[in-house]
Interface confidence: low
Amino acid sequence: ATPEPCQIDDEDVRCVCNFTHPQPDWSSALQCVAAVEVEIRGGGRSLEEFLLKSASANPKQYADMLKALRLRRLTVGAARVPAQILALVLHALGFSRLKELTLEDLEVTGQVPPPLQETPGPALTTLRLRNVSWATGGAWLGELQQWLQPSLKVLKVAQASSLAFPCAQLRAFPALTTLDLSDNPGLGERGLTAALCPRKFPALEDLALRNAGMETPSGVCAALAGAGVQPHRLDLSHNSLRATAAGARECVWPAALSSLNLSFAELEQVPKGLPPKLTVLDLSCNKLNRAPRPEELPAVDDLTLEGNPYMDPEALQHQEDPMA
């Protein structure tokens, strides 16, 4: 006997579905209706079979049932999803009280149609996307945004196929405080400039760019200045950073910036042109082979330097003598 594709825990909190069977029993998902957190994986299959069934579907007739769901967090993954199906799901979720939506390992085919005026989508606070490809390239964010109420606080996009957003088609994200573009190693500073559409992220406080192909702190500074964003905290850890190239223009960092993470950045010296004043600066786990001089560092309340060779004489010796 094949195992049930969906499993719900004893307290009806979390329900996980893995539809890996060639003829999956989709009705198994009905046991998830009581759950707060639902994870559905499609086994890499195409959901095109639902297109015909969905043609006449009207989520409004199920509005009361959808409103009564305990569902707060939903993950959908491992499938090829026609854009019309995605639109229908977002329409239906607009009647629910969903707060967090995660899409991962998806291929969205076709263009997401715009919603009708009277049907707002879900009032999400968090949207996460990982390894999602879109037929419409960088236009995907604008297409998705049309379906979301302006409540989004956290947007995390990893392993994206395109982050070059057509800025003219985007509305502002008035509540967005966290933008995480980590794990996009092909992004780079030029890509960051394209992704940070001016005046679209007025409330941004946290910007995470771990493993995002960043090259110099001053290049990131220039991208932030060009977009006019004012993050309080910036995470550039896990990038291979260079000290600013000679002749680079001086850049004025956002005045609000108080915390900068440059850990695991392969830095051999403290980069030039850091913000003059910070509350927190993390330079841990780099390749600094001498203690930074006070004039190299900004005025900082909380400085972390652990894990650099100069603090470990043995590691420094290995670095200087590669045969050791």
Epitope: R73, K153, E205
Partner: antibody, heavy 121, light 106 residues
């Protein structure tokens, strides 16, 4: 840096109520669930419940649903826990702790220093 | 409720030793397990999350392993500052903690 500030101690009479506070700073208060944990030497650590400061959604441990009420004041970035009908068994250290932001629940990445509650006549 | 059992309440060790603290969940919790260290008069501090990922700033002598129902925290080359209480925690369904294991000197 992230800080969760709690008063060091509270002394209350049996049968009374108390409202413990936890002031958050150094991060966006409304982005992370705030949890409360009870610790007594004989019982170890017990999770009481959590609150989403964004919209005050709460989840409680069933053992505390008639004992604790969690609230927040977004304007001051402060979380509160009110404990009612206090008995000697409520004497403990109470910690507020921030839930790291992963989706299916998450570990607690920052903890307050704890408030020692003593119930005594 | 999911019960997290730390069968050893006390463990004796010496500086430089390798020690393993174990924790068993009463039902499947995937890798949704964290380990915390608590020293007298202090708050717990997260060491390991998602069963095997070291938290920021935690020395690499601390390693976590396991999935499903059986989990282990291993401290290699124990230092005197590692003498403390260690708690496991599951966060697969709400939150429950183990009863703790006190690491003390032989």
């Amino acid at each position: 840096q992230v800080r969760l500030q709690q008063p060091g101690a509270e002394l209350v009479r049996p049968g009374a109520s108390v409202k413990l506070s936890c002031k958050a700073s150094g991060y966006t208060f409304t982005t992370y669930w705030m949890n409360w944990v009870k610790q007594r030497p004989e019982d170890g650590l017990e999770w009481i419940g959590r609150i989403d400061p964004y919209d005050s959604e709460t989840h409680y441990n069933q053992n505390f649903k008639d004992k604790a009420i969690l609230t927040v004041d977004k304007s001051s970035s402060t979380a509160y826990m009110q404990l009612s009908s206090l008995t000697y068994e409520d004497s403990a250290v109470y910690y507020c702790t921030r839930k790291e932001g992963r989706q299916w629940g998450a570990y607690f990445d920052y903890w307050g220093q704890g408030t020692t509650l003593t119930v005594s006549s | 409720d999911i019960v997290m059992t730390q069968s050893q309440k006390f463990m004796s060790t010496s500086v430089g030793d390798r020690v393993s603290v174990t924790c068993k969940a009463s039902q499947y919790v995937g890798t949704n397990v964290a380990w915390y260290q608590q020293k007298p008069g202090q708050s717990p501090k997260a060491l390991i999350q998602s069963a095997s990922y070291r938290c920021s700033g935690v020395p690499d002598r601390f390693t976590g392993s396991g999935s499903g129902t059986d989990f282990t925290l291993t401290i290699s080359n124990v230092q005197s500052e590692d003498l403390a209480d260690y708690f496991c925690q599951q966060y697969n369904t709400y939150v429950t903690f183990g009863g703790g294991t006190k690491l003390e000197l032989k």
